[in-house]
Amino acid sequence: KAMHVAQPAVVLANSRGTASFVCEYASPGKATEVRVTVLRQADSQVTEVCAATYMMGNELTFLDDSICTGTSSGNQVNLTIQGLRAMDTGLYICKVELMYPPPYYMGIGNGTQIYVIDPEPCPDSD
């Protein structure tokens, strides 16, 4: 009955503070409406980073002010988180909810440790 969600263990953000990873879920049924939420866990505190609900076959739409973008393909969601800084290094959990049709299922990944390294400032050039 439990829905399995897989995501990479570790991802390194690029120099522009962007990190991408795939969240894949094993759907027990044929869901038509799916909600994907990215959560950040730090010191046992969990906070929402972003969330999007989408109809299967359609694109993910995050809110305009979201730091996340994404695309979906079957039971895979390709997530990108932007604007990350060193202080944002942490465990990012992918949560998937099959909202419709019944029954409802929820799946939680083990989390992706995202490492963010702030770029060194460029030295002044004469």
């Epitope: 906070t47 949560k95 909202m99 419709y100 019944p102 409802y104 929820m106 939680i108």
Partner: antibody, heavy 118, light 108 residues
């Protein structure tokens, strides 16, 4: 701090209706799914119904399907339970509960008592 | 529907003793989706453990959860007077959400 406060309970005759409310505060209501759970006198916990973030998706226990309707007003931070065709076996304390980020019911209201009797 | 069966129905123990409560599921429940709640008379349930073994905020470390698949356990290492209550397990991975019938931990 997170607070859930139920209201609307009372004594009602079989076949009649009642509407429960749950006022939420201390968190972004629209970012959480919500539930109603009930507990008959001296008995255990029974899940009743669930509603999604935007209110578009609702699930019900078989025992209340077709009689109870869950709804929410995100602009008022309030969850509702419309109970029609009430039966004696619906007598219980009704709790609203918030779904935590990782799935468990992390906050509960204090409950409101519904008594259905002749 | 996943049926959860708790045992024993009642546990009679003295303060300072260890309490072991069992919850068995009719089919496999992912460990990420099993919770334990405590309920005292006249009060709402309170979340103790989620994800089978993670303690909720503010829960003392004498409470611990374990298990996977169909068999889960809540352990209270040393019972304090305030721990005498009814304990419920719950699965929340799929609808309908279900609870066990409860285990009452009473003072011997």
């Amino acid at each position: 701090q997170v607070q859930l406060v139920e209201s609307g309970g009372g004594v009602v005759q079989p076949g009649r209706s009642l509407r429960l409310s749950c006022a939420a505060s201390g968190f972004t209501f629209s970012s959480y799914t919500m539930h109603w759970v009930r507990q008959a006198p001296g008995k255990g916990l029974e899940w009743v119904t669930f509603i999604s973030y935007d209110g578009n998706n609702k699930y019900y226990a078989d025992s209340v399907k077709g009689r109870f309707t869950i709804s929410r007003d995100n602009s008022k931070n309030t969850l509702y339970l419309q109970m029609n065709s009430l039966r004696a076996e619906d007598t219980a304390i009704y709790y609203c509960a918030r779904t935590g980020w990782l799935g468990p019911f992390d906050y509960w209201g204090q409950g409101t008592l519904v008594t259905v009797l002749e | 529907e996943i049926v959860l069966t708790q045992s024993p129905g009642t546990l009679s123990l003295s303060p300072g003793e260890r309490a072991t409560l069992s919850c068995r599921a009719s089919q496999s429940v992912g460990s990420s989706y099993l919770a334990w709640y405590q309920q005292k008379p006249g009060q709402a349930p309170r979340l103790l453990i989620y994800g089978a073994f993670s303690r909720a905020t503010g829960i003392p470390d004498r409470f611990s959860g374990s298990g996977s698949g169909t068999d889960f356990t809540l352990t209270i290492s040393r019972l304090e007077p305030e721990d005498f209550a009814v304990y419920y397990c719950q699965q929340y991975g799929s609808s309908p959400w279900t609870f066990g019938q409860g285990t009452k931990v009473e003072i011997k």
